[in-house]
């Protein structure tokens, strides 16, 4: 039961995480205009990975895509790549993990195959989460660097009393969505890996026991521990010899504690 719960929860957490990564990637608020120095602006600027937007005090919002590929900073391209890789890996991981779920029966899939699929999806989720966290962190670092650079030359005099206020950008909502989503995907991946350990078949070799009955002899040979799908009994994998019975979910079931920051 604990394995099913861990696997199911890992899947759900990863699903939420990947949805968050997709949302963060599509969001326009990766960087937002810092209003600390200019709280009275009637024009609010914010930027995403794909376009930059301006919201005027009337509520009118105008967005312009980055229609150049070569003219964009290498760091921005790297962040885009990391986020896309994260989404792709996460999507594949989700697809694999659906078939690996213990509560879903697909033909006569071996438990070892389900365990392998669970481990594969878990690793994919971990890498996906790391990609998202890395992407968001790279962008955040870029913002911090630019913020202090623009602070250093905040006002550039243009002769006499004329001043040009340089627009500074700070962390946007997408960064926080990305960090949380990446973290959730990572946690979901770890949970899947933990669940995999419980799904792996336990190769227990019992000695054959012979019972000599009158007239004929029958040898009962135990089959290994085979995990059923949870929907009814699987006669093919039925355990004949009961040497201290344990339910499938009790095998390799370790309680895990996750700290959410």
């Amino acid at each position: 039961m604990a394995v099913t719960a861990c696997q199911g929860l890992g899947f759900v957490v990863s699903l939420i995480g990947i949805a968050g990564i997709i949302a963060a990637t599509c969001m326009d608020q990766w960087s937002t205009q810092d209003l600390y120095n200019n709280p009275v602006t009637a024009v609010f600027n914010y930027q995403g990975l794909w376009r930059s937007c301006v919201r005027e005090s009337s509520g009118f919002t105008e967005c312009r895509g980055y229609f150049t590929l070569l003219g964009l900073p290498a760091m921005l391209q790297a962040v885009r790549a990391l986020m896309i890789v994260g989404i792709v890996l996460g999507a594949i991981g989700l697809l694999v993990s659906i078939f690996a779920l213990k509560c879903i029966r697909i033909g006569s899939m071996e438990d070892s195959a389900k365990a392998n699929m669970t481990l594969t999806s878990g690793i994919m989720f971990i890498v996906s989460g790391l990609c998202a966290i890395a992407g968001v962190s790279v962008f955040a670092n870029m913002l911090v660097t630019n913020f202090w650079m623009s602070t250093a030359n905040m006002y550039t005099g243009m002769g006499g009393m004329v001043q040009t206020v340089q627009t500074r950008y700070t962390f946007g909502a997408a960064l926080f969505v990305g960090w949380v989503a990446g973290g959730l995907t990572l946690i979901g991946g770890v949970m899947m890996c933990i669940a995999c350990r419980g799904l792996a078949p336990e190769e227990t070799n019992y000695k054959a026991v012979s019972y000599h009955a009158s007239g004929h002899s029958v040898a009962y040979k135990p089959g290994g521990f085979k995990a059923s799908t949870g929907f009814g009994s699987n006669t093919k994998n039925k355990k004949i010899y009961d040497g201290g019975a344990r339910t499938e979910d009790e095998v390799q079931s370790y309680p895990s504690k996750h700290d959410y920051v």
Epitope: V40, T41, A42, V43, N45, S52, S57, S58, R64, V162
Partner: antibody, heavy 120, light 113 residues
Framework: EVQLVQSGAEVKKPGASVKVSCKAS????????MHWVRQAPGQGLEWIGY????????KYNEKFKGRVTLTRDKSTSTVYMELSSLRSEDTAVYYC?????????????WGQGTLVTVSS | DIVMTQSPDSLAVSLGERATINCKSS????????????LAWYQQKPGQPPKLLIY???TRESGVPDRFTGSGSGTDFTLTISSLQAEDVAVYYC?????????FGQGTKLEIK
């Protein structure tokens, strides 16, 4: 047709308060911010503040903060500008002006103006 | 606050001639996010409220004759009336639309010579 119709002229004593109304018609009242601007006799234009009829959000010129209050009545599509502690230098024509949606923060329609005279 | 300074204070131009009004702001009105200038020009005739002529420094409001042209960027802006008509006699104001408080120039009175 967009119309902003303001209340009539007022004569007030120093220290008193005045409340000027501006009734909007011809457009969706809650979709456009309303600004207030004043013009002293023979002088230039001075921005007082604005009210967002959608959420009742306001922003005031620091010069008038504490003395001016902008309110709105959605049921009658009317905005109000109340100026308290009147002084003789508050004698001016007060205009309400609608902030255009795609006019780069410029005011596209103006009321006819309300003359407020502060005199003892 | 952004200070808007117009020049000249008054201007007399012959009918059919070109009229040029300048406006200078103490801070740039160019928004880096969209490379647009947040400056408007208004025309005010005696006893009337101001009328929007130009917004975004160079975009004519609908219904405004094409003899009115706005130009400039950053801190220096110009309103040009290519061929002055009798009905153009008015006071013209430039306005900062970029930062609060919105501020206006002192006005330029345009008359016929």
């Amino acid at each position: 047709e967009v119309q902003l119709v303001q209340s009539g002229a007022e004569v007030k004593k120093p220290g008193a308060s005045v409340k000027v109304s501006c009734k909007a018609s011809g457009y969706t009242f809650t979709s456009y911010i309303m600004h207030w601007v004043r013009q002293a006799p023979g002088q230039g234009l001075e921005w007082i503040g604005y009210i967002n009829p959608y959420n009742d959000g306001t922003k005031y010129n620091e010069k008038f903060k504490g003395r001016v209050t902008l309110t709105r009545d959605k049921s009658t599509s009317t905005v109000y500008m109340e100026l308290s502690s009147l002084r003789s230098e508050d004698t001016a024509v007060y205009y309400c002006a609608r902030l255009g949606f795609t006019t780069r923060n410029a005011m596209d329609y103006w009321g006819q103006g309300t003359l407020v005279t502060v005199s003892s | 606050d952004i200070v808007m300074t117009q020049s000249p204070d008054s201007l007399a131009v012959s009918l059919g001639e070109r009229a040029t009004i300048n406006c200078k702001s103490s801070q740039s009105l160019l928004n880096s996010g969209n490379q647009k200038n947040y400056l408007a020009w208004y025309q005010q005739k005696p006893g009337q409220p101001p009328k929007l002529l130009i917004y975004g420094a160079s975009t004519r409001e609908s219904g405004v004759p094409d003899r009115f042209t706005g130009s400039g960027s950053g801190t220096d802006f110009t309103l040009t009336i290519s061929s002055l008509q009798a009905e153009d006699v008015a006071v013209y104001y430039c306005q900062n639309d970029h930062s609060y408080p919105f501020t206006f120039g002192q006005g330029t009175k345009l008359e016929i010579k």
